[in-house]
């Protein structure tokens, strides 16, 4: 339905508070280097303008698109060229090219200082004295560091952030109450950001069809009692929501997400028996809850899939008449029967089935040709099953830290050209799969493991895209979304790699190592491990294990010494020499 003023429409739909928060997130995700105060100023100007349009939709400029209004506002920033370089050239373009230009300049790894958490009392004072500013600062800091964060979900996180401070700043032991909550929010936020980054990459790099296919698989697993028409409706609406958010259309995205939540709650009976609790919650919690709802129970009387998709004489006719609908139905039917499969596996099976039909439907005896198509699925299913079994065994054997090290060695040997910080970050995240998934019951393991790995490998892909250094990474990242994980798994040691020259500075450590948190110490050690592998790519796991044990002993010894710095200076070069010998 057409509105005279889009900005007035969204302001009225969302309400002033959410409108302002979403505009702040949008601006922070576009201009990631701008100071907080500058963004607040821009947001207030936009909000005042929106109010004039609510009062009179025919007022000057109120008929302009949101992209035009927001783009014009961003282009008023005085220091645009100094701060952002060629992003300033976007302002010379017309919409929609200008918005596309801004999107292309979003930086997944902006050069921003790490967020330092102030003392609890300092945070509580700031929260109590300037609650609104404090919460808006949270939105700003998260949004600028995560330019693809799912905006309506970020508002939910801000609400949880507020609740944590409201509760804990009144507690007897503020720190004991607040810090675990903030840690949990930080971890959940990073996970949410990474998941959304995969959705945006899927849409932007592989198109709407790829995203819709993934959504059909997931929605069908969640709502196995819903019929195909209902699943299609939810998937279409969900695709619109994510397309908008990934495209920077955050007001439309949040508005449409609320509409979808409303629809789902009004149609619970035909979707899932698991929505009741979610639908009793207020908007932000409701949408979050619906997005994370558990799978409904499978209907008892599901027919054999082979009837319609293998044994039917009409397979080729149905496929030819409406390929996308037919494949959508296949994916829906297969997915609702297999909550135990990862979404990526389900998409691979659909791809294999489609390839078989393409081949067989052109033959004289199509049925004879595709009669055994489901048997061909077996190796595709066994591959992630083996992956889960093997990696969970390793995780249980080693524990998270040593499992991360195992993966770090594996991936450094596969793609040694990738920067060490990226290899460490990605391997640490890959290693967390064990903690997250290996304790799950058998039926939940594969979807947990493989779909989580897809999220983490997408982080590698987006970081690598910024500064491409490895053709192998580029190939795995760009050829096929659904085959990314198998592509990386299949990579062997890169035999073409020339070992990195030894740099003593890389392996020189100081007393400051002792004051680092456990996590920071691990990162330091893992950085050294990756550099060691780059220097000696032919080193065996046993050799590397010995060196790492010696290194851990060296750190422990020197951190116990009276003169720590002297110990590091004296023992460090000895360790390096011994390691060189051990790895010769």
């Amino acid at each position: 339905d057409a509105h005279k003023s889009e900005v007035a429409h969204r302001f009225k739909d969302l309400g002033e508070e959410h409108f302002k928060d979403l505009v702040l997130v949008a601006f922070s995700q576009y201009l990631q280097q701008c100071p907080f105060e500058e963004h607040l100023k821009l947001v207030n100007e936009v909000t005042e303008f929106a109010k004039t349009c609510v009062a009179d939709e025919t007022a000057e400029n109120c008929d302009k698109s949101l992209h035009t209004l927001f783009g014009d506002k961003l282009c008023t920033v005085a220091t645009l060229r100094e701060t952002y370089g060629d992003m300033a050239d976007c302002c010379a373009k017309q919409e929609p090219e200008r918005n596309e230009c801004f999107l292309q300049h979003k930086d997944d790894k902006p050069d921003l200082p790490p967020l330092v958490r102030p003392e609890v009392d300092v945070m509580c004072t700031a929260f109590q004295e300037h609650e609104d500013t404090f919460l808006k600062k949270y939105l700003y800091e998260v949004a600028r560091r995560h330019p693809y964060f799912y905006a309506p979900e970020l508002l939910f996180f801000a609400q949880k952030y507020k609740a944590a401070f409201t509760e804990c700043c009144q507690a007897a032991d503020k720190g004991a109450c607040l810090l675990p909550k903030l840690d949990e929010l930080r971890d959940q936020g990073k996970a949410s950001s990474a998941k959304q980054r995969l959705k945006c990459a899927s849409l932007q790099k592989f198109g709407e069809r790829a995203f819709k296919a993934w959504s059909v698989a997931r929605v069908s697993q969640r709502f196995p009692k819903a019929d195909f028409t209902e699943v299609t409706k939810v998937v279409t609406d969900l695709t619109k929501v994510h397309t908008e958010c990934c495209h920077g259309d955050l007001l439309e995205c949040a508005d449409d997400r609320a509409e979808l939540a409303k629809y789902m709650c009004e149609n619970q009976d035909s979707l899932s028996s698991k929505l009741k609790e979610c639908c009793e919650k207020p908007l932000l919690e409701k949408s979050h809850c619906l997005a994370h709802v558990e799978n409904d129970e499978m209907p008892a009387d599901l027919h054999a899939l082979t009837d319609d998709y293998v044994e039917s004489k009409d397979v080729c006719k149905n496929y030819a008449e409406a390929k996308d609908v037919f494949m959508g139905m296949f994916l829906y039917e297969y997915s609702r029967r297999h909550p135990d499969y990862s979404a990526m596996l389900l998409l691979r099976l659909a791809k294999a089935y489609e390839a078989t039909l393409e081949k067989c439907c052109a033959t004289a005896d199509p049925h004879g040709c595709y009669a055994k198509v489901f048997d061909e699925f077996q190796p595709l299913v066994e591959d992630p099953q083996n992956l889960v079994k093997h990696n969970c065994e390793l995780f249980e054997q080693f524990g998270e830290y040593k499992f991360q090290n195992e993966l770090l060695v594996r991936y450094t040997k596969k793609v040694p050209q990738v920067s060490t910080p990226t290899l460490v970050e990605v391997s640490r995240n890959l290693g967390k799969v064990g903690t997250k998934c290996c304790k799950q019951p058998e039926a939940k393991r594969m979807p947990c493991v493989e779909d989580y790995l897809s999220v983490v490998l997408n982080q590698l892909c987006v970081l690598h895209e910024k500064t491409p250094v490895s053709d192998r990474v580029t190939k795995c990242c760009t050829e096929s979304l659904v085959n990314r994980r198998p592509c990386f798994s299949a990579l062997e040691v890169d035999e073409t790699y020339l070992p990195k020259a030894f740099n003593a500075e890389t392996f020189t450590f100081h007393a400051d190592m002792c004051t680092l948190s456990e996590k920071e110490q691990q990162v330091k050690k893992q950085t050294a491990l990756a550099e060691l592998v780059k220097h000696k790519p032919k080193a065996t796991n046993e050799q590397l294990k010995t060196v790492m044990e010696d290194f851990a002993a060296f750190v422990e010894k020197c951190c116990k010494a009276d003169d720590k710095e002297a110990c590091f200076a004296e023992e460090g070069p000895k360790l390096v020499a011994a390691s060189e010998t051990a790895l010769a």
Epitope: D227, F228, D301, L302, H303, A304, L305, T306, D307, D308, Y309, V310, E311, S312, K313, D314, K317, N318, M329, E333
Partner: antibody, heavy 121, light 111 residues
Framework: EVQLVESGGGLVQPGGSLRLSCAAS????????MGWVRQAPGKGLEYIGI???????YYASWAKGRFTISRDNSKNTVYLQMNSLRAEDTATYFC???????????????WGQGTLVTVSS | DIQMTQSPSSLSASVGDRVTITCQSS????????LSWYQQKPGQPPKLLIY???DLASGVPSRFSGSGSGTDFTLTISSLQPEDFATYYC???????????FGGGTKLTVL
């Protein structure tokens, strides 16, 4: 007892619509394709169409557009929606269970007793 | 549209006779054998006798048999019994489920 029972027939004016139901008992409809066949008074059998277990529908060329078959597995019922009815649609309408699940083999091994539809002004 | 032609359209015979009814399709049936035979008595729904050209449906006496392939098929009743007087229909399945078709019927009466 395994049986199919049609209902919804009756007198309808030309141009009118009617929805016939076919309720199954003693077995689950989700395991077989279900077809509709009609028989004008004193005439032979005429195939209307079929719905597969997965919901794929297939219609005789003359029925396409006017007739729609659907199923509700939770109610164990198949439906035939008939629109723009004409005098020549007067017949007994049977629902029948095909031997196959995904298509029409022409071998219907379980039939309902039929419901009479009369189109007349 | 695909035509199914049954002959004869009517037939009189006596108890104990051997009776043959033929069915011809304008196109080959699916897999060359997707043809069924039905028996219908007044006021009753049809009853499946034969499927896949020659397979006897459950509970059907062995005096009924079917044969044929492609476009030409035959239903044989080896020794007619009093309860066999009825109308018989053939039905063919073709490469598309939309094309399933019945023959015009053969009315078998007492001579």
């Amino acid at each position: 007892e395994v049986q199919l029972v049609e209902s919804g027939g009756g007198l309808v004016q030309p141009g009118g619509s009617l929805r016939l139901s076919c309720a199954a008992s003693g077995f689950s409809l989700s395991s077989n394709a279900m077809g509709w066949v009609r028989q004008a008074p004193g005439k032979g059998l005429e195939y209307i169409g079929i719905i597969s277990v997965g919901g794929f529908t297939y219609y005789a060329s003359w029925a396409k557009g006017r007739f729609t078959i659907s199923r509700d597995n939770s109610k164990n019922t198949v439906y035939l929606q008939m629109n723009s009815l004409r005098a020549e649609d007067t017949a007994t309408y049977f629902c029948a269970r095909d031997r196959h699940g995904g298509d029409s083999s022409g071998a219907f091994y379980l039939w309902g007793q039929g419901t009479l539809v009369t189109v007349s002004s | 549209d695909i035509q199914m032609t049954q002959s004869p359209s009517s037939l009189s015979a006596s108890v104990g006779d051997r009776v043959t009814i033929t069915c011809q399709s304008s196109e080959s049936v699916y897999s060359n054998n997707q043809l069924s035979w039905y028996q219908q008595k007044p006021g009753q729904p049809p009853k499946l006798l034969i499927y896949d050209a020659s397979d006897l449906a459950s509970g059907v006496p062995s005096r009924f048999s079917g044969s044929g392939s492609g476009t030409d098929f035959t239903l044989t009743i080896s020794s007619l019994q009093p309860e066999d007087f009825a109308t018989y229909y053939c039905a063919g399945g073709f490469s598309s489920s939309s094309d399933t078709a019945f023959g015009g019927g053969t009315k078998l009466t007492v001579l």
